[in-house]
């Protein structure tokens, strides 16, 4: 038998909150559990769904979840079925609504001394408790001639008088929560002695020096007073006009006339009506001076034939808002057709070449008129005047490739070299007519070139192959001065290129032949073991049939690398004494010695009286000062190599000898003393 271990039970629930109806069964076989609501099966949704055997509610809904729920367990094999006890929700809720007029039937029927009933359409369960408000202030029972039942949703005013006028709102609360009226009711009960608006002044826009009229009328019993004020609360009357309102006239019917309006007259005017009773009624209107700004410039436009294009005219800022229209050849454009005006836009449908020309946008208001022209060009596809042709260009000379085309507007020409866009630099120049100039043609310029001539209407292109007629040249040119280390192997390369592969040979500049230990192998001069007799001038000669021969002269120096015979040592010297930094170097060619102190080269011609560099390279500094301290670098260099060595110089104060020290006591440092 199927047994319910847990059965659903009726319970309180809150609108929009979670809830759970529990159901647990025990049975010998496999059972299938489902739920019924008022006898109909419950379908799972995101809001309400089965969770195990229980029914879970993500958000209780007072409309969809009202009724009786029942848990049903069924054994599909035996057909046995068991049903739980019924369960339902006591759903607590509250929902806002408007304040509405219940009696009389319409607002038009509200008269002084009649009964007025307002109803608060806030509903809820349990039944809410209501509170009424006038102009935000709570109303209590029996207050000022009105009967209020806070248990009820009705507010009765009997009888209703002008003092009951105001904005009525209500709030209600119950166990679920609180809500206030979604729409409030304004009760307006006229008092004959209150000033009432008959004709309100309207904002006015006038051109400078024109006239402006404000109308204003109130009614009341007895008739009300009417007064005009301007901006700074200055009263305007026919007897006392403020200085800046000399041309103001107030008529008997309340209208205000301003003549020959100036900018200082612009501003807010107030018309005030005061009845025998009640508050003053203040009406405002603004006098604006008409104005119109300049229009922004149009960029020239280029369109293609057959397309549809639009040009928007941004109206200038102005008061009142300017009206806008387009003209072409002095004629206003229609609002339909192939070329027409739509709103502020100029529309050109299926553009023809004949549509090219100047179109004018006009804007006008009370303050005046503005206009702005736009130049419209109808683009055409370029046509050839001269295509680029396959060319032979000489290396080292300028070369030209032509790409001459014509179109409207003037076409732009770009060149590609091996499919790569050519950007103008010191070697490539594209002239205004599209011709490409290659300055100083190089061998690798021999490739495909393509020019593309374009307008917005389309483009044409053509390509040409460039063949470079290579000049006879050394690649690279041999260094004119080269050094070889004595008694070492050395090579001096020489290579050349030309239209035909050149032959290369070396010879001594004096014409003598190369000694047997020096070989010339395909342009590389090879010294197996450099002797001093190998020093001198050599010539590399490159030649071919069509281009003749070229020569490169090389002076070879036989060198012995620089060695320091004497290097400067770390030296400490008393202030005021003399410092000697020794440096001797030898090498072949004989090296020159330079000194660097404090990161600057010491120029022997600008050393001053305290410093001196001897012939042998040693540096002497007399009368040393603390600022002479630092690193000193001896640099030995010749035309073949350079070497340097450095040592620090420390300048110290001479210590005051203590009594215990004899005259022969050694100084506390390894010193140079003079």
């Amino acid at each position: 038998a199927i047994v319910f271990i847990k059965q659903p039970s009726s319970q309180d629930a809150l609108q929009g909150r979670r809830a759970l109806l529990r159901c647990e069964v025990e049975a010998p076989g496999l059972v299938h559990v489902y739920w019924l609501l008022d006898g109909a099966p419950v379908q799972d949704t995101e809001r309400r769904f089965t969770q195990g055997s229980s029914l879970s509610f993500a958000a209780v809904d007072r409309l969809q979840d009202s009724g009786t729920f029942q848990c049903v367990a069924r054994d599909d094999v035996t057909g046995e079925e068991a049903r739980s006890a019924n369960a339902s929700f006591n759903i607590k809720w509250i929902e806002a609504g408007p304040v509405v007029l219940k009696h009389p039937a319409s607002e038009a029927e509200i008269q002084p001394q009649t009964q007025v009933t307002l109803r608060c359409h806030i509903d809820g369960h349990p039944r809410p408790t209501y509170q009424w408000f006038r102009d935000g202030t709570p109303l209590s029972d029996g207050q000022s001639n009105n009967t209020v039942s806070s248990k009820e949703r009705n507010l009765t005013l009997r009888p209703a008088g002008p003092e009951h006028s105001g904005l009525y709102s209500c709030c209600a609360h119950n166990a679920f929560g609180q809500a206030c009226s979604s729409q409030n009711f304004t009760l307006s009960i006229a008092d004959e002695s209150f000033a009432r608006v008959v004709l309100a002044p309207q904002d006015v826009i006038v051109a400078r020096n024109e006239e402006a009229m404000f109308h204003c009328q109130f009614s009341a019993q007895p008739p009300p007073n009417l007064q005009w004020l301007f901006e700074d609360e200055t009263p305007i009357t026919n007897r006392s006009r403020p200085p800046h309102l000399r041309r103001a006239t107030v008529f008997a019917n309340g209208s205000l006339l301003l003549t020959q309006v100036r900018p200082r007259n612009a501003g807010v005017y107030r018309c005030i009506g005061q009845g025998q009773r009640g508050p003053p009624v203040i009406l405002e209107a603004t006098l604006h001076l008409a104005e119109i700004e300049d229009m922004p410039l149009f960029e020239p436009r280029v369109f293609t034939a057959g397309s549809e294009e639009r040009v928007t005219c941004l109206p200038p800022k102005g008061l009142p808002e300017p009206s806008v229209w387009w003209e072409h050849a002095g004629v206003r454009l229609p609002t339909h057709g192939r070329v027409y005006q739509k709103g502020h836009e100029l529309v050109l449908a299926s553009i023809a070449e004949s549509d090219a020309g100047v179109y004018t946008c006009h804007a006008a208001n009370l303050a005046g008129q503005r206009r702005q022209d736009v130049n419209i060009t109808v683009a055409t596809v370029p046509t050839w005047l001269k295509k680029p042709q396959d060319s032979q260009l000489e290396e080292g000379k300028p070369g030209y490739l032509h790409c001459l085309t014509q179109a409207t507007p003037k076409p732009t020409v770009v060149w590609y070299r091996n499919q790569m866009l050519i950007s103008e630099d010191s070697r490539f120049e594209v002239f205004k007519n599209g011709t490409l100039r290659i300055n100083n043609v190089e061998v690798y310029d021999g490739t495909w070139y393509r020019c593309v001539s374009s307008t917005p209407a389309g483009s044409i292109e053509a390509q040409a192959r460039v063949q470079v007629l290579e000049k006879l040249k050394f690649t690279p040119p041999p260094q004119p001065q080269q050094c070889m280390e004595f008694d070492k192997e050395a090579t001096v390369p020489c290579s050349a290129t030309g239209r035909e592969k050149p032959t290369i040979k070396w010879e001594r500049a004096d014409g003598s032949s190369l000694p047997e230990w020096v070989t010339d192998n395909a342009g590389t001069l090879h010294f197996a073991r450099v002797t001093r007799d190998d020093a001198g001038n050599y010539t590399c000669i490159a030649s071919n049939g069509p281009q003749g021969q070229i020569r490169a002269h090389v002076q070879l120096t036989v060198a012995v690398f620089i060695t320091f015979k004497v290097e400067p040592e770390r030296t400490t010297v008393y202030q005021g004494h003399t410092a000697l930094l020794q440096c001797e170097a030898q090498g072949d060619p004989k090296p020159l010695i330079q000194w660097k102190g404090k990161d600057r080269i010491l120029d022997p011609t600008k050393l001053g009286p305290r410093m001196h560099i001897f012939q042998n390279g040693s540096l002497v500094i007399h009368d040393v000062a603390p600022e002479d301290s630092g690193r000193y670098t001896c640099i030995a260099g010749n035309s073949c190599n350079i070497k340097h060595t450095e040592a620090p110089l420390y300048v110290v104060d001479k210590p005051v000898p203590e009594e215990s020290e004899g005259p022969g006591s050694p100084p506390p440092y390894k010193m140079i003393q003079t």
């Epitope: 008694d487 002797t531 001198g536 012995v560 690398f561 620089i562 060695t563």
Partner: antibody, heavy 120, light 113 residues
Framework: QVQLVESGGGVVQPGRSLRLSCAAS????????MHWVRQAPGKGLEWVAV????????YYADSVKGRFIISRDNSRDTLYLQMNSLRAEDTAVYYC?????????????WGQGTLVTVSS | DIVMTQSPDSLAVSLGERATINCKSS????????????LAWYQQKPGQPPNLLIY???TRESGVPDRFSGSGSGTDFTLTISSLQAEDVAVYYC?????????FGGGTKVEIK
């Protein structure tokens, strides 16, 4: 002050080997070329071999080529001469000499020498 | 190889007198690039290693007395001791360092008469 001290000399039979060393001090050994020069008893001076400051080049007199090997260890400031297949005519005082620079073949400092006697 | 020939083989000179030693090279040792003669003179006293006296044919090594002087150019060179002193008794060698291998003269023995 520059000092060169040779060692490793002695009496050796023909065809045998001997290794001479020269310990250097008082200068930057790795900046100078180094040579071996020999002097047979009662005879003049004969240049034997050179090694450059960096050990990159080595040259020999024709009389010892293929038998003697010059080498140096700049980290130990030491020069070596490996003498193989010694002959009677190799008998001499062997001097280690410093080059005037890197490769001048001019000798500004000499060691006291070590005597090598090749005799059966 | 450049052959160096010294003369005389030996020389006896009175104390305070001038001694002159000659050296001849089989090839020019004057280097045109710097106009220097690649020739040196050494002094070897009995039981001692040689000692550099003069290089560039005429430049005295530091510490060498000025009574020693060198001269000559190209292939012919001379070492002169202007006033012989007792400590100058030695064998004197010339050497070329113009080309490899470096070669020495046979030596000149200087004695006191």
């Amino acid at each position: 002050q520059v000092q060169l001290v040779e060692s490793g000399g002695g009496v050796v039979q023909p065809g045998r080997s001997l290794r001479l060393s020269c310990a250097a001090s008082g200068f930057t050994f790795s900046s100078y070329g180094m040579h071996w020069v020999r002097q047979a008893p009662g005879k003049g001076l004969e240049w034997v071999a050179v090694i450059w400051y960096d050990g990159g080049n080595k040259y020999y007199a024709d009389s010892v080529k293929g038998r003697f090997i010059i080498s140096r260890d700049n980290s130990r400031d030491t020069l070596y001469l490996q003498m193989n297949s010694l002959r009677a005519e190799d008998t001499a005082v062997y001097y280690c000499a410093r080059d005037w620079g890197s490769s001048w073949y001019l000798f500004d400092h000499w060691g006291q020498g070590t005597l090598v006697t090749v005799s059966s | 190889d450049i052959v160096m020939t010294q003369s005389p083989d030996s020389l006896a000179v009175s104390l305070g007198e001038r001694a002159t030693i000659n050296c001849k090279s089989s090839q020019n040792v004057l280097y045109s690039s710097n106009n220097e003669n690649y020739l040196a003179w050494y002094q070897q006293k009995p039981g001692q290693p040689p000692n550099l006296l003069i290089y560039w044919a005429s430049t005295r090594e530091s510490g060498v007395p000025d009574r020693f002087s060198g001269s000559g150019s190209g292939t012919d060179f001379t070492l002169t001791i202007s006033s012989l002193q007792a400590e100058d008794v030695a064998v004197y060698y010339c050497q070329q360092y113009y080309s490899t291998p470096p070669t020495f003269g046979g030596g000149t023995k200087v004695e006191i008469k």
